[in-house]
Interface confidence: low
């Protein structure tokens, strides 16, 4: 009977850690001679196996080749890596007496796809918190995928955003792959509570997805409003002054009340009131006491926000001179913000 | 001939995240067909795996340590590390770098390195 | 987990006398286990790889043999040098584990 190899799968697939069959027959044993197993073709393939009863780590021949009628010379490659991916030739020989074997026939070859999951999207962002309206750029990483083809996305509180560069790495044949995109998000100081969300497809996944994730509230600063009010005086002698400062994150905030430029008092929120957007609100009631203040005296409510330059407020109560009804003080704000960079 | 050694902190506060090196001589840990392997062994007792690498990326952990435990291969200084989150008394052992060739035994061994977690 | 139940946890015999060492897996792994010698204060140091194939240099009085869930370890003729612990390990399903050890000592 003429000789024969036969390869029938032109490609198989297979997980990375799991087995595969590599299918080889032949129609004749003749004429004697081994039937090897290589990966790749020309000089530099790499003998895998041959059916010579040596140890050959994970790989084991499926049938009994030592039956003088067997033709099966399909063998079994176990815990399957990447580094395994290539095509793998069934290759007949014939036996030299002093000279070396001679290759005679070659199977068509199968081409092994080792599927290797990539690992969990790692998102990375700037490395200062940004403030709203300016643009941000965060980067989101996975590797040790095989085959090459991936899918990566990018959403913000469910939408999908574009990203600015997306590349898989190296552009040629490996073993696996790496995959890393670049998308840039404009904050508002509606993003605290946001998730900027780096979603990875690929074929080991069976359609659930890798997800990184974001929080803006890692990424973003917004700024109090700060305002001071008057409150109606609780007795004639008393003033009540209030500093309110809005809608700020991170919580780290210090205030500091001022008489006429010297420091009168140091408050360090400990309850701070949080929005449903995430942000947080403060509010420091100080008493002045009006009969201790015969001439005008400017009140200070200085906020320090996330060490960031100092946010501040004026508000002037004018003395009893001042006043026809001595019973009685009379206020004047000045809710202009002056920055103080000390 | 392949020479495993780990390097890194013998003592460990609770809590704290534990790091170890494995510095492969000898041979290159990016030549491929090889599995980097992380082992402990608490005081009189049995051997555990924690989990492996692949230098190109593929990583397999034990799921018992799966959400602490963190493998990573640096191909250029021909290392590999083990990074263990949130320790406590119970993470003391001698810590073992392997090279396991095809999964077919770890036949090359560091000589263990005694990390202690204490406060 | 693959469970490994070693047997016996220790002994102790004679030089020269034959040990035998059991692991059973509690699910079928092929071919799929090693087992390692482990001497006091050292690394473990491969010994059989693949159930029954002896590891370059180490001596041909340890063997091993088995397939399934049924494993067997043994040393022919048991020399001083041989006071360690055993372990059995599989690699058929991840995790890989390890079989709890016997600890081997002379009379």
């Known amino acids: 009977k003429e000789l024969k190899v036969t390869q029938p799968e032109k490609s198989v697939s297979v997980a990375a850690g799991d087995s595969t069959v590599l299918n080889c027959t032949l129609t004749s044993l003749l004429p004697v001679g081994p039937i090897r197993w290589y990966r790749g073709v020309g000089p530099s393939r790499l003998l895998i196996y041959s059916f010579a009863g040596e140890y050959v780590p994970r790989i084991r021949n499926v049938s009994d080749t030592t039956k003088r009628n067997n033709m099966d010379f399909s063998i079994r490659i176990s815990n399957v890596t990447p580094a395994d991916a290539g095509i793998y030739y069934c290759v007949k020989f014939q036996k030299g007496s002093s000279e070396p074997d001679t290759e005679i026939q070659s199977g068509g070859g199968t081409e092994v796809y080792v599927l290797a999951k990539p690992s969990p999207p790692e998102v990375s962002g700037p490395a200062d918190r940004g403030i709203p309206d300016q643009k941000v750029n965060f980067t989101c990483k996975s590797h040790g995928f095989s085959p090459r083809n991936i899918t990566l996305k990018w959403f913000k509180d469910g939408q999908e955003l574009h990203p600015l560069e997306t590349t898989v790495n190296p552009s040629g044949k490996n073993v696996s792959y790496n995959i890393s995109s670049t998308v840039r998000v404009v904050l508002n100081s509606m993003d605290v509570n946001s998730k900027v969300i780096c979603e990875v497809a690929h074929i080991t996944l069976d359609r659930s997805p890798l997800r990184g994730i974001a929080n803006l509230s890692n990424f973003i600063r917004v700024s109090p409003t700060v305002k001071v009010t008057q409150q109606s005086p609780t007795s004639m002698n008393q003033v009540n002054l209030t500093c309110r400062a809005e809608r700020f994150y991170p919580e780290d905030l210090q205030l500091i009340w001022l008489e006429n430029g010297n420091v009168s008092r140091n408050d360090t929120p400990k309850n701070l009131t949080k929005n449903t957007d995430g942000t947080y609100n403060y509010t420091s009631l100080f008493l002045v006491n009006s009969s201790a203040h015969r001439e005008d005296v400017v009140f200070t409510c200085q906020v320090k926000h996330d060490q960031q330059p100092a946010i501040t407020r004026n508000h002037t109560v004018l003395g009893f001179a001042h006043s026809s009804d001595q019973g009685s003080m009379q206020t004047f704000p000045d809710n202009n913000a002056t920055h103080n960079w000390n | 001939q392949v020479q495993l050694q780990e390097s890194g902190p013998g003592l460990v506060k609770p809590s704290q995240t534990l790091s170890l090196t494995c510095t492969v001589s000898g041979g290159s840990i990016s030549s491929g067909g090889y599995y980097w392997s992380w082992i402990r062994q608490h005081p009189g007792k049995g051997l555990e795996w924690i989990g492996a690498i692949y230098y190109s990326g593929p990583i397999y952990y034990n799921p018992s340590l799966k959400s602490r435990v963190t493998i990573s291969v640096d191909t250029s200084k021909n290392q590999f590390s083990l990074k263990l989150s949130s320790v406590t008394a119970a993470d003391t052992a001698v810590y073992y770098c392997s090279k396991e060739g095809y999964h077919s035994g770890m036949d090359v061994w560091g000589q263990g390195t005694t990390v202690t977690v204490s406060s | 987990d693959i469970q490994m139940t070693q047997s016996p946890s220790s002994l102790s015999a004679s030089v020269g006398d034959r040990v035998t060492i059991t692991c059973q897996a509690s699910q079928d792994i092929s071919d799929y286990l090693n087992w390692y010698q482990q001497k006091p204060g050292k690394a473990p140091k491969l010994l059989i790889y693949?159930?029954?194939n002896l590891e370059t240099g180490v001596p041909s009085r340890f063997s091993g043999s088995g397939s399934g869930t049924d494993f067997t370890f043994t040393i022919s003729s048991l020399q001083p040098e041989d006071i360690a612990t055993y372990y059995c390990q599989q690699f058929a399903y991840l995790p890989w584990t390890f079989g709890g050890g016997t600890k081997v000592e002379i009379k």
């Open positions: 693949d159930a029954d």
